[in-house]
């Protein structure tokens, strides 16, 4: 009953003489375990005897014995995990036919048939290509062989035009109940050059020998492959020649459909054949030519052909690196004269006159001078002739004003306060002078260009310079004005002593002045309007307080005289001329107030007083006034005072105070 049995295997197994077969097989039986397994070769059912007959290749019994098996046949099955796999090694051509798997369980019987196809020679693998091969697009080539057996080592090897392809092919094998195969997969990026080439998949044995092979011719779709040819085969032609370019399509798959020509990347109109003819070429036809050919895969562009049309130099023009050029700068002259081939010789002209020793396209004047100004032109020459000389280019050489000088217009001598006129002159200039500059800068009048009027000239306007200016300023040498003026900066200066003046010191005063023009001067000293001396110094051998006062000195020259500020001479001395005065007289009644005042002459003033009696006893009073209140008869006697400043001390003569009794005292007596 077929419903009780489920057996899985590949159905047909392929092999060749001397190889082996490996038959993957699994089974399931519904009612219990497999008890007997017999492998028949081409079994036939005998109706009479109700049993299968044929060559028994293998037989297993309950206890697992193999009573009469061939050694080359192995049952690799296992009743426990329902495996019925078997192998035949080696396998022979006469093993072809049906393998009958007779399976018997306790209650059921089944005959499963497996086809075995053993060829005399190894059969070829099959190459499987993708439907479309396109250049540079990676594809996978598959080589499939319906064979695999654990006991027989094989290899699949790829070749291109008979040479092994050493890209890494991935080989896989399958020995499952679904399928038995060996497969090699090769990743391959076909190039256009592979089109029409033969790819072979070889089946190799363990020693690498070819057992069989499959071949395919590659149909690689690719854009047209082009080369370009020029007739005559020179790409350098002369103006007026004719040139033919041919676009050769070396390969195209599929066939090309359109042709176009390009010059410098721009399509040429109405040029759509493989041949391009240029009649009587002109200079403008110089350029890079290529053809573009398209097929269904896409467009392809040939290599570029650089067509050079030769012609004599064209009328020249001169390019000057800078004009106007500044004197002293570097100027480059370039002769521009389109020509092919490039000119080999140049002739230069300055104001129509040939410049000797200059034969290059470019020349340089490192330091340009005014005389280099003018018109420059050139002629270019190549193998085809001498070009026309162009109109030339003007070189303007600019420079600062030259030989700038300054002139004093008014008569000399110049006195402080005069009006002075100066003019600024120059010899030449390019461009013209447009303004002047003066130094020092002052609020001075410029009545006309290049003339300066200085009104009320200052004593210190010693030198003036002018510049004549265009784009640059050129300065004249400064002119000394030699302004005459009365002495200036007159002042009294104490020379000695260095510190403060004390009575009795030797004192010197100096009459200083800062400047005078002319230099010859006279000095005068005065005190309180009285003339003291005519030297630059005023000397005191021993100064006295009476010499103190306000001093001035005068300095004069031929232009005028100048006085110093009044200078105060201060003499310091110790207290002198001390005396004691009594406001109420020398005689005072007892009980009244007696006031004694210490008067003195001192510089600086007295800062401390002391009082003494007739016994030279110091009294406890330190002020300028000594008040005795109430005065007593005992106070009668002589008194004196002492004054102190920082210079020294002085004391008064004695003064006598007489205190008499009051009437009351006399009455009491």
């Amino acid at each position: 009953d077929s419903s009780k049995w489920n057996i899985e295997h590949p159905g047909t197994i392929y092999a060749w003489e001397g190889a082996c077969v490996w038959v993957p097989c699994t089974y399931r039986v519904l009612d219990g375990a497999l008890e007997t397994f017999i492998l028949f070769h081409n079994p036939e059912y005998n109706q009479n005897m109700s049993k299968f007959e044929g060559t028994r290749l293998y037989e297993s019994t309950k206890d697992g014995k193999v009573p009469s098996g061939q050694k080359r046949v192995q049952f690799l099955g296992n009743k426990i995990n329902n495996n019925c796999t078997l192998s035949i090694h080696p396998v022979h051509v006469n093993d072809s036919g049906q393998l009958g798997l007779r399976m018997v369980s306790k209650t059921e019987k089944w005959m499963e048939r497996i086809h075995l196809n053993v060829s005399e020679r190894p059969f070829p693998p099959r190459i499987q290509l993708p439907p479309k091969l396109q250049e540079s697009q990676e594809v996978t080539l598959t080589c499939l062989l319906n064979f695999s057996c654990y006991g027989y080592q094989i290899q699949l090897q790829w070749l291109l035009e008979g040479v092994p392809m050493r890209q890494a092919a991935v080989t896989s094998t399958s020995l499952s109940t679904k399928s038995v195969f060996t497969r090699s997969e090769l990743k391959f990026s076909p190039q256009w050059s592979h089109h029409g080439k033969i790819v072979t998949c070889e089946l190799h044995d363990v020693d690498g020998k070819v057992l069989s092979e499959d071949m395919v011719q590659l149909n690689v779709k690719h854009t047209p492959k082009l080369t370009i040819e020029v007739t005559p085969n020179e790409t350098i032609v002369r103006k007026g020649d004719s040139v033919t370019m041919t676009c050769k399509v070396n390969s195209s798959n599929p066939e090309y459909t359109t042709v176009s020509w390009l010059k410098d990347g721009i399509p040429l109109k109405e040029q759509n054949t493989l041949m391009l003819t240029l009649h009587e070429v002109t200079k403008s036809q110089t350029g890079r030519y290529c053809c573009r050919v398209s097929n269904d895969v896409g467009p392809a562009t040939s290599e570029k052909v650089f067509l050079q049309v030769q012609y004599a130099p064209e009328p020249s023009r001169v390019q000057i690196s800078q004009s106007p050029a500044v004197e002293g700068s570097e100027v480059n002259f370039l002769c521009i004269s389109p020509a092919n081939p490039l000119p080999t010789n140049y002739t230069w002209y300055h104001n129509g006159k040939e410049v000797q020793g200059r034969t290059e396209k470019q020349f340089q004047i490192q330091k340009i001078l005014p005389w280099h100004a003018g018109t420059y032109s050139c002629e270019a020459e190549n193998i085809l002739g001498i070009g026309e000389r162009g109109p030339g280019t003007e070189l303007d050489v600019q420079y600062p004003p030259k030989k700038v000088t300054m002139v004093i217009e008014n008569p000399t001598p110049i006195r402080e306060g005069d009006t002075v006129t100066l003019s600024c002159n120059y010899s030449s200039s390019n461009p013209i002078v447009n303004h002047y500059e003066w130094r020092p800068r002052g609020a001075w009048e410029e009545p006309s260009l290049g003339v300066l009027k200085i009104q009320n000239i200052g004593w210190n306007n010693t030198a003036v310079a002018c510049a004549a200016c265009n784009n640059w300023c050129s300065w004249a040498s400064p002119v000394t004005l030699n302004v005459l003026y009365a002495p200036r900066g007159v002042r009294v200066r104490k020379i000695k002593p260095l510190s403060e003046i004390h009575s009795g010191n030797s004192v010197s005063l100096q009459c200083d002045f800062s400047s005078s023009h002319p230099k010859e001067v006279q000095f005068f000293w005065e005190k309180n309007g009285s003339l003291l001396g005519k030297e630059s110094q005023l000397n005191f051998d021993s100064i006295s307080p009476e010499d103190a006062g306000s001093y001035s000195c005068w300095v004069n020259n031929s232009i005028g005289q100048t006085a110093s500020k009044a200078w105060t001479l201060e003499v310091l001395y110790a207290p002198r001329r001390l005396r004691v005065s009594m406001s109420q007289g020398n005689q005072v009644m007892e009980g009244k107030t007696a006031t004694l005042t210490c008067e003195s002459d001192a510089n600086p003033p007295v800062y401390s007083y002391a009082w003494f009696d007739w016994n030279n006893q110091s009294l406890p009073y330190s002020g300028r006034m000594l008040r005795l209140e109430p005065v007593k008869v005992q106070h009668s006697g002589a008194y004196w005072c002492q004054g102190t400043n920082r210079v020294g001390k002085g004391h008064s003569p004695l003064i006598t105070l007489t205190v008499y009794y009051s009437p009351q005292t006399i009455g009491r007596r």
Epitope: E17, G18, R166, D205, V206, G208, V210, L211
Partner: antibody
Framework: QVQLQQPGAELVKPGASVKLSCKTS????????MQWVKQRPGRGLEWIGR????????HYNENFTTKVTLTVDETSNTAYMHLSGLTSEDSAVYYC????????????WGQGTSVTVSS | DVVLTQTPLSLPVSLGDQASISCRSS???????????LHWYLQKPGQSPKLLIY???NRFSGVPDRFSGSGSGTDFTLKISRVEAEDLGAYFC?????????FGGGTKLEIK
Amino acid sequence: QVQLQQPGAELVKPGASVKLSCKTSGYTFTIYWMQWVKQRPGRGLEWIGRIDPHSGDTHYNENFTTKVTLTVDETSNTAYMHLSGLTSEDSAVYYCARRDYSYYVLDYWGQGTSVTVSS
Amino acid sequence: DVVLTQTPLSLPVSLGDQASISCRSSQSLVHINGDTYLHWYLQKPGQSPKLLIYTVFNRFSGVPDRFSGSGSGTDFTLKISRVEAEDLGAYFCSQSTHVPYTFGGGTKLEIK
């Protein structure tokens, strides 16, 4: 042109090892299997084994499996044969030879290296 | 392993003579792919073997046409139509049908 260069001679002590080289030029090294052959006077030629330089796959004559190790260095296009546990029986001339991939014939041979095992 | 028996062991010849060397195999050298991998080499003294004939009858590049090979299955022959001085040396047959490859014992071609 195809060339296989081998050193002229090696002198080694018994029990030691030696590594013979075979430097190739003039062809694509990885396409052709390299074979090694031993020749002793009066004993003819013996095939030792082969190596596929592309895969490094080797196959040895059973008589040499414990004696020989074949290797290649693709970067220098050089094949090597390592002989170990040398005895006087290993004294011989050893040739490397390229095997053609179409007819499985040894078409180009090296000049051979003479190995002498002596104490 | 396949045994190749070469006869004669030594072959004395005169220059200009024909020479013939036989090589017999212990089993068929026809590979399953149909090709027979029997080859002939010449080894001159102090040199390495040089290929003469491959797969029974194909002459290797540069080999003069006085050398020819024949045979099938297990019996093979190398013939030299007119021996020249440069042909002297030891000739070996070799098979690469079965692994391991094997060589005949050699035949020494020498002047009489």
